[in-house]
Amino acid sequence: MNGRVDYLVTEEEINLTRGPSGLGFNIVGGTDQQYVSNDSGIYVSRIKENGAAALDGRLQEGDKILSVNGQDLKNLLHQDAVDLFRNAGYAVSLRVQHRLQVQNGPIGHRGEGDPSGIPIFMVLVPVFALTMVAAWAFMRYRQQL
């Protein structure tokens, strides 16, 4: 891919209820299993069909999980992170970071690569400004006709 790849980064609180077969997803990452270079965070690598996460619909492959029931996932060994999910109880609250590619092709979730992103307002503000300018120019043009 040519050029720089930028991302929209948004955070969301997702509350899942553990289903008959559990939460229904896989994770990668941790201090001993870096999935993204220079980032030991925990990422979703697979959403299982018909599992609790899939049925809820908000958690996506490539999402970074920041905390579980308020407990930070920073600087954890991979197995410790797995155990944290397994012992999280029936109702599980996930703080999740979604990263959407906004340049170089169609928008899509990214599970790997540059973990840095750009805040959503840095994209939306210029887009809004351009829209306003275009609308103003159009109105001026119509008045001249």
Epitope: S21, G22, N26, V28, R46
Partner: nanobody, 127 residues
Framework: QVQLVESGGGLVQAGDSLRLSCAAS????????MGWFRQAPGKEREFVAH????????YYADSVKGRFTISRDNAKNTMYLQMNSLKPDDTAVYYC?????????????????????WGQGTQVTVS
């Protein structure tokens, strides 16, 4: 997409040994949770062995415990199945299987549905 290629099968005598290999594509091999399954003619696919991402945790079917050893080399993107004291009952097509990452639920490692990618299989015949 993950590609898996098994090798090492063949025709051996009862009591002999074989070592199967499963070579996998992808730069994130060290995150894969992996397993071996087998299928004899006219039978269901059967769990053989499982290994976690680091190789620190393994599980075996009762029928192969003490005879088979599963291992992996993350530097070579390869998983192995060392099969000793082979019996005619071990005759089957052997498949390696992969899921990316570790399930956050108690892992049902013997369930084929837990795995996303499968190799084409390698035939093991014990006479």
């Amino acid at each position: 997409q993950v590609q898996l290629v098994e090798s090492g099968g063949g025709l051996v005598q009862a009591g002999d040994s074989l070592r199967l290999s499963c070579a996998a594509s992808g730069r994130t091999f060290s995150t894969y949770t992996m397993g071996w399954f087998r299928q004899a003619p006219g039978k269901e696919r059967e769990f053989v062995a499982h290994i976690n991402w680091s190789g620190s945790s393994t599980y075996y079917a009762d029928s192969v415990k003490g005879r088979f050893t599963i291992s992996r080399d993350n530097a070579k993107n390869t998983m192995y199945l060392q099969m000793n004291s082979l019996k005619p009952d071990d005759t089957a097509v052997y498949y390696c299987a992969v899921t990316i990452g570790s399930p956050v639920d108690s892992y049902r490692h013997s369930d084929p549905l837990e795995y996303d990618y499968w190799g084409q299989g390698t035939q093991v015949t014990v006479s």
